[in-house]
Interface confidence: low
């Protein structure tokens, strides 16, 4: 066929940049050289489908489906996925083809299924098929690292008991807070196993491979800081090692560190101590506390003592199985058009959860943020003002959790028109939902004042975009308004907005766009 | 509408302390990171730091690390901006600004409040 | 951190001419496909004021004279008939990340 244009599907895999965001062109992610998925067409199939060659995805991995389209003139484009219509904005390279994307980020199961793409072009109109599997890992395993002492040595080794065999690296950072962040100039990774210097502020272990990366921090008391207003809590899974390490800095070498258990002295062989001078030659004494596999009666509070600094305890909490405590009623937000705003959930959880957002279809990367009271933080503040339906997914080895919020932008509305040889429809969104009002525009009433209300059928909520609702108002035609100028008008809170229409002419007329 | 007003001028010692506050009003003070912004005599501006009111979480610049701290109020809608161990080269005028992140379409400064620190 | 370099430190213009003020960022300040530069006004003894957010998108009540553009690390500020009122301190501001940082400034002054 003659008439059918040139079309080159690929698939470009992206390194995972934890701040990108899923976009339909332009993305900060780094990529690897596209690799094309053939795009043959599909014999048999009713109208014009192309179907690209399968594409297997590993399980958090990001890629973009992309398809350039050499075809004269402007193109205009819909995705579907899973009967949802998704946004698509077409753009043109730098040999004049059309160029469609659709990213993935962080590749999981709800995001696997069939693509299909369509494609209006001045020419013709053609569907595209792609189909996303996620490739079977299923022997593939990242677990949360954890620590035991090395034998007849003061050092720690680092385990994680990954499939395929993970790299771990030692995150030590001598600085407090925000300046521990992981690409601070502060922290030093050290990709090794065993770890001898146990003196730094902040230690983490961490381990990744082709499923990602799990840190464990080493839990630490410090005596010379301020205590929590609220006591820190560790939760272990029965079966885990605890590990607690009590820090404290003198200026010199007398002082002794202990540390008990529901003010009973720990066992000897469930900790040990390490002492070095600083280069300010004050005395620094860490004490670790550790059992290598905790049971329920190792739940309580476990107390530091120093003979020259206040005493400090955390609560250590035994639990049978993972938890992610959050409430979760979906909530419903209601924003100006410019006004800044956050979702946000406040959670419990252990182990450490795993969490998307995701707003129509598109999975968002989500941060935590621990707080002083136990709990942790995400917030989403990346909506760009589009109203909808947004998802908080959690989940870690032993819980899941799932969050709705509705997403509402108050503005006035903006009218677009239909009319056909028997009815003149109007569509607005804006939010709160708008009101419809019909004049009549005739020698009697030149300003359009002439209400109608014969005739007028008004349906809230016809159409639902990702949680947008839309608003129409239709006008049966009657003998009476043939041929005249009519006005439909959409008002809320915000303000009206109206369009004047020719009935008995093919299309809208947009005579006057009252705003 | 959106008004920020700030406490009036203060004159300090060096080594003293100072708190700057910042009443907000026409907007819902918990929706909008509060941000604090200084400005020495003759010279240009110089971000300190920055508040969301919803859950008190802070942003500071390094630079003033350990000598600021910002705290917001939501009962009295009014943020804070506490600066300690003050030196001569402190004297400036500080600003409060409520300021969106991307959508910077409408932002407010307050009037601004200088604070002298001389002997 | 990232630092803002503003060009030029000063620029002697007459009302009626056009001026070009230039910011550049040490690293890129774009992030989810937005430029995150800010451009403000400020004259004596007055807080700043917003004129142009996100690269190129207009503050509120700023008059159409003022225009921005640039992405990445480089980014413009144009006036493209000053007005006696535009003789000013410019700064541009980064909000892409913590510390939020603001350019040295540009002094525009009357020939």
């Known amino acids: 066929n003659q008439d059918l244009p040139v079309i080159k599907c690929v698939l470009i895999n992206h390194k995972n940049n934890d701040s990108s965001v899923g976009k339909s062109s332009s993305y900060p992610m780094v990529s690897e050289s596209p690799e094309d998925l053939g795009c043959a067409l599909r014999p048999q199939s009713s109208g014009t489908v192309y179907e690209a060659a399968a594409v297997e995805v590993d399980v958090s991995a990001s890629i973009t489906l992309q398809v350039l389209v050499d075809a004269p003139g402007n193109i205009s484009c819909l995705w579907v996925f899973k009967h949802s219509s998704l946004n698509c904005q077409p753009h043109f390279d730098l040999q004049n083809r059309g160029v469609v994307s659709m990213v993935i980020l962080k590749m999981t199961e709800t995001q696997a299924g069939e693509y299909l793409l369509f494609i209006q072009s001045e020419a013709t109109n053609y569907t595209i098929l792609f189909t996303v599997s996620i490739r079977n890992t299923l022997l593939y395993t990242l677990r949360r690292p954890y620590f035991r002492k090395m034998e007849n040595q003061d050092a720690l080794v680092c385990i994680s008991e990954s499939v395929p065999e993970p790299i771990v690296e030692w995150v030590l950072c001598d600085s407090q807070g925000e300046s521990c962040k992981e690409e601070s100039p502060a922290v030093v990774k050290k990709e090794e196993k065993v770890l001898h210097e146990l003196f730094g502020t902040d230690i983490r272990c961490c381990a990744r491979n082709e499923l990602g990366r799990e840190c464990t921090r080493l839990f630490t008391i410090d005596l010379n800081q301020t205590p929590q207003t609220t006591l820190p809590q560790l939760f272990l899974k029965v079966g885990e090692p605890l590990w607690i390490r009590c820090k404290a800095v003198h200026v010199n070498h007398g002082f002794g560190l202990t540390w008990e258990l529901e003010n009973k002295a720990l066992e000897e062989g469930n900790y040990f101590e390490m002492s070095t001078y600083s280069t300010n030659r004050t005395m620094i004494r860490i004490l670790f506390a550790f059992v290598s596999s905790v049971a329920r009666n190792d739940t309580g509070y476990y107390t530091c003592s120093s003979s020259k600094h206040p005493s400090q305890s955390a609560l250590v909490t035994i639990v049978e199985k993972g938890f992610i405590n959050a409430t979760n009623s979906s909530e419903d937000y209601e924003i100006d058009q410019y006004e800044e705003f956050c979702f946000s959930v406040r959670f419990k959880a252990y182990p450490q959860i795993r969490c998307t957002w995701t707003f129509s279809r598109k999975s968002f990367p989500c941060e935590q943020k621990g707080l002083d009271n136990g709990y942790s933080i995400s917030k989403f503040c990346n909506h760009k003002h589009q109203p909808g339906e947004y998802i908080f997914h959690a989940e870690n080895d032993d819980a899941q959790f799932t969050k709705m919020f509705t997403l509402n932008i108050r503005r006035k509305p903006q009218v677009l028109a239909e009319a056909s040889a028997s009815q003149a429809s109007c569509f607005s969104d804006g939010y709160p939902l708008p009101s419809w009002t019909w004049k009549k525009c005739s020698d009697k009433s030149p300003n359009c004042t002439e209400e109608i209300t014969e005739g007028v059928w008004n349906r809230k909520a016809n159409r639902k975009v990702f949680g947008q609702w839309v608003s129409s108002s239709t006008l049966n035609m009657s003998e009476a308004i043939k041929g005249f100028l009519v006005k439909c008008c959409a008002y809320n809170s915000l303000g009206t907005s109206c369009e004047t229409i020719l009935l008995n002419s093919p299309g809208p007329f947009p005579f006057i766009q009252d705003n | 509408q959106v008004q920020l007003v700030q406490s009036g001028a203060e004159v300090k010692k060096p080594g003293s302390s100072v708190k700057v506050s910042c009443k907000a009003s026409?907007?819902?003070?918990?929706?909008?990171?509060m941000h604090w912004v200084r400005q020495a005599p003759g010279q240009g501006l110089e971000w300190m730091g920055e508040i969301d009111p919803s859950d008190s979480y802070t942003n500071y610049n390094q630079k003033f690390k350990g000598r600021v701290t910002i705290t917001a109020d939501e009962s009295t809608s009014t943020a804070y901006m506490e600066l300690s161990s003050l030196r001569s080269e402190d004297t400036a005028v500080y600003y409060c600004?409520?300021?969106?992140?991307?959508?910077?379409?409408?932002?407010?400064w307050g009037q601004g409040t200088l604070v002298t620190v001389s002997s | 951190e990232i630092v803002l370099t503003q060009s030029p430190a000063t620029l002697s213009l007459s009302p009626g001419e056009r001026a070009t003020l230039s910011c550049r960022a040490s690293?890129?300040?774009?992030?989810?496909?937005?430029?995150?530069m800010n451009w403000y006004q400020q004259k004596p003894g007055q807080a700043p004021r917003l004129l142009i957010y996100?690269?190129?998108e207009q503050g509120s009540g700023i008059p159409a004279r003022f225009s921005g553009s640039g992405s990445g690390t480089d980014f413009t500020l144009t006036i493209s008939s000053l007005e006696p009122e535009d003789f000013a301190v410019y700064y541009c501001w980064q909000s892409k990340e913590v510390p939020w940082t603001f350019g040295q400034g540009t002094k525009l002054e009357i020939k």
């Open positions: 600004a409520r300021s969106a992140y991307y959508s910077k379409r409408d932002d407010y």
């Open positions: 690293e890129s300040v774009d992030n989810y496909g937005i430029s995150f």
């Open positions: 996100a690269a190129s």
């Open positions: 026409g907007y819902t003070f918990t929706s909008y990171w």
